[in-house]
């Protein structure tokens, strides 16, 4: 069974998938469509790297542009380095600027909804 066939079988169960499962899926050429990606748990999507999301979505990655202001895409963009987002060539904006450090202050992030940044 190839990645696409596997994805069709598990698609309806993905809404509650944890990050680890999504990372594993990204290695299987599943080409997840944007509607499915948008239904994933935000907390499961946030830790994914740009490279992992690119592999997870495959040719559908360009669809991130259309959904850049919707959750969970918007929240995921805010967590990525702008340099990494730029590698997608989609013009996605709102990533962490070059030279900034991301402090994983869980309590502050939980309160504010965005990571804490330290400038250069």
């Amino acid at each position: 069974m190839n990645g696409s066939e596997y994805f069709v079988k598990i698609q309806s169960f993905l809404g509650g998938a944890p990050t680890e499962d999504l990372k594993a899926l990204s290695q299987q050429n599943v080409s997840m469509d944007l509607a499915t990606f948008m239904k994933l748990r935000t907390d499961a999507v946030l830790p994914l790297t740009v490279a992992e999301v690119q592999k997870l979505l495959g040719p559908h990655v360009e669809g991130l542009k259309a959904e850049e202001r919707h959750r969970p895409v918007r929240d995921w963009i805010l967590r990525q380095r702008q340099d990494d987002l730029d590698t997608l060539g989609l013009g996605l904006q709102g990533g962490i600027p070059n030279g900034y450090l991301v402090l994983d202050l869980s309590m502050q992030e939980a309160l504010s909804g965005t990571p804490c940044l330290l400038g250069p």
């Epitope: 469509d33 509607a35 239904k39 669809g63 542009k65 202001r69």
Partner: antibody, heavy 119, light 108 residues
Amino acid sequence: EVQLQQSGPELVKPGASVKIPCKASGYTITDYNMDWVKQSRGKSLEWIGDVFPYNGDSIYNQKFEGRATLTVDKYSSTAYMELRGLTSEDTAVYFCARRKTGTGYFDVWGTGTTVTVSS
Amino acid sequence: QLVLTQSPAIMSASPGEKVTLTCSASSSVSSTYLSWYLQKPGSSPKLWIYSTSNLASGVPARFSGSGSGTSYSLTISSMEAEDAASYFCHQWSSYPYTFGGGTKLEIK
């Protein structure tokens, strides 16, 4: 057959609100975005905003932010646009339009609802 | 916001004539993010062309779309009476999504 059915014409007074329904059929409403577009008489089209029905997340054209609210009742497969504080400038035809998630084009349009604001 | 300017605003063409409608953007738009809609009086708009050059389902092959950057066009190779309508270009490259002012195409 995929269809978006909207309600009939509305005549409302200045300052009042209107809530326009858009009933989706022939597909699963939570699998697509729903956008709303305004067309003033004899004029072009203006994007109001869109909602992702699965989680109700909505985004708006800044021009309509604060006055428009987009919602969805998943169980009746109906999207709604509420517009508040109406003025004569809001007299127009309002369309709902289905947008395949991950694209920016509208592949199915509603029948349109004419809203006339007049005292 | 990104402004789309369509020209001409109104034009008429004879049956069999080649017709070109243009859409000019105030800043560059990726070809993926440009589409065209057709609208007849009293009706809802219909998706006609998406991603600059892809014909929507049911659109006759006499229609084509092309362009890049700030300049896009819709061409009808041989005008037919049923092509008389208003045509709107649309971009989703930047928020808010915007539409051109439209070109009303009439049959002579």
